[in-house]
């Protein structure tokens, strides 16, 4: 058989952050190539990454068509230089991925504090609304556009001079918090989707502290 040295892919894994979605698998190919197919539960298979020697395939363009659908992918193995060859059952070797629902499973990317502004004893902290690769009407949607009120942010803030952290939450991209006059504060934010069962939280944003150039201070 022409497939004697062909092995099926294994360890198929979805890697997805803010809907940028890549399927990874093993092994590194030796005398073989791969083609990936993706489908929704009720849809037709679409081929991607034809006859590649890579062990990953970017499927973002497919999943962003409807991030609430559940997707299944499969990786076909072919002998290098003889991609028409089939296995003993009359079709190429392939392995199925786990199911993947982008809306429920994509990792939330590390957020960024866009700005903070102090007015007297109030500080307004704004989180950047990151653009995703999800499109509608030829425009890219932001994370907030996609998740709406399902997405909240948690703010951690503390006096520069102490380690005791306070928290605040918002279902928008802005916080308005009370601070002590004359004190400098540091801030970090985390994206959270409370309704999820997996991948509920992002990593924390980089810390930003008052007295640095990102913020603005106004004495009233």
């Amino acid at each position: 058989s022409g497939t004697t040295n062909t092995v099926a892919a294994y360890n198929l894994t979805w890697k997805s952050t803010n809907f940028k979605t890549i399927l990874e698998w093993e092994p590194k190919p030796v005398n073989q190539v791969y083609t990936v197919q993706i489908s929704t539960k009720s849809g037709d298979w679409k081929s991607k990454c034809f006859y590649t020697t890579d062990t990953e395939c970017d499927l973002t363009d497919e999943i962003v068509k409807d991030v609430k659908q559940t997707y299944l992918a499969r990786v076909f193995s072919y002998p290098a230089g003889n991609v028409e060859s089939t296995g003993s059952a009359g079709e190429p070797l392939y392995e199925n991925s786990p199911e993947f629902t982008p809306y429920l499973e994509t990792n939330l990317g590390q957020p960024t504090i866009q700005s903070f502004e102090q007015v007297g004893t109030k500080v307004n902290v704004t989180v950047e609304d990151e653009r995703t690769l999800v499109r509608r009407n030829n425009t890219f949607l932001s994370l907030r556009d996609v998740f709406g009120k399902d997405l909240i942010y948690t703010l951690y803030y503390w006096k520069s001079s102490s380690s005791g952290k306070k928290t605040a939450k918002t279902n928008t991209n802005e916080f308005l918090i009370d601070v002590d006059k004359g004190e400098n504060y540091c801030f970090s934010v985390q994206a959270v989707i409370p309704s999820r069962t997996v991948n509920r939280k992002s990593t924390d944003s980089p810390v930003e502290c008052m007295g640095q150039e990102k913020g603005e201070f106004r004495e009233i």
Epitope: K68, N137, L141, R144, G148, K149, D150, N171
Partner: antibody, heavy 120, light 111 residues
């Protein structure tokens, strides 16, 4: 073709229940929300409520005790029920698609509307 | 409850005029920007013009533009065309789960 279309009786007797159906085509209710909006003759638009792409419902506080929106009766349809109707509920009723899929107020596809008269 | 107040209620203008309609919210709209503008002609369904405060909806002429944030928003028609005489509504989502609201409308009529 992406469209929504309202249907239901044009006359309802008080204090009965107004029941309308919105048939959608060309898009998935698992990805887009649907809102109901009404317009009394010669007056402005009033938001009734929304069912989002996750099936959660949101209602105008002034109508909340009387309104139910659901999409579990048939595939690709959203229903509106408004109970204990009075003449003040006489209006053109519209269903419309929510562009973002949640209760965002951005309604990009509208039905032609159906006039419901409440009268005995 | 979220309340949206449009001004003016009626606006008389001529073809070629620059027209501005204001929408004020009783409290900040959701994430300061989820406000939409609609055009409605008699006997017809409303048509989405602008969403997310400033994004032009598909197929809408570029003479329409939107701006604003938080509680104050404007719809501008840079050069009024005969087809633009209609009633305009703003609509917004609010941070609380329940509320979406429409403004009372602004009728743009021929001077």
């Amino acid at each position: 073709q992406v469209q929504v279309q309202e249907s239901g009786p044009g006359l309802v007797k008080p204090p009965g229940t107004l029941s309308l159906t919105c048939a959608v085509s060309g898009f998935s209710l698992s990805y887009y929300g649907v809102s109901w909006v009404r317009q009394p003759p010669g007056k402005g638009l009033e938001w009734i409520g929304t069912i989002d792409s996750s099936g959660r419902t949101y209602y105008n506080p002034s109508l909340k005790s009387r309104v139910t929106i659901s999409n579990d009766n048939a595939p690709n349809t959203v229903s509106l029920k408004l109970s204990s109707v009075t003449a003040a509920d006489t209006a053109v009723y519209y269903c419309a698609r929510d562009f973002y899929g949640w209760n965002s107020g951005a309604l990009d596809i509208w039905g032609q509307g159906t006039l419901v008269t409440v009268s005995s | 409850d979220l309340q949206l107040t449009q001004s003016p209620s009626t606006l008389s203008a001529s073809v070629g005029d620059r027209v501005t309609i204001t929408c004020r919210a009783s409290q900040s709209v959701y994430s300061n920007k989820y406000l939409s503008w609609y055009q409605q002609k008699p006997g017809k369904a409303p048509k989405l013009l602008i969403y997310k405060a400033s994004t032009l909806a598909s197929g809408v002429p570029s003479r329409f533009s939107g701006s604003g944030s938080g509680t104050e928003f404007t719809l501008t028609i840079s050069s009024l065309q005969p087809d633009d005489f209609a009633t305009y509504y703003c609509a917004a989502a609010y941070s609380d789960d329940s509320d979406t609201a429409f403004g009372q409308g602004t009728k743009v009529e021929i001077k």
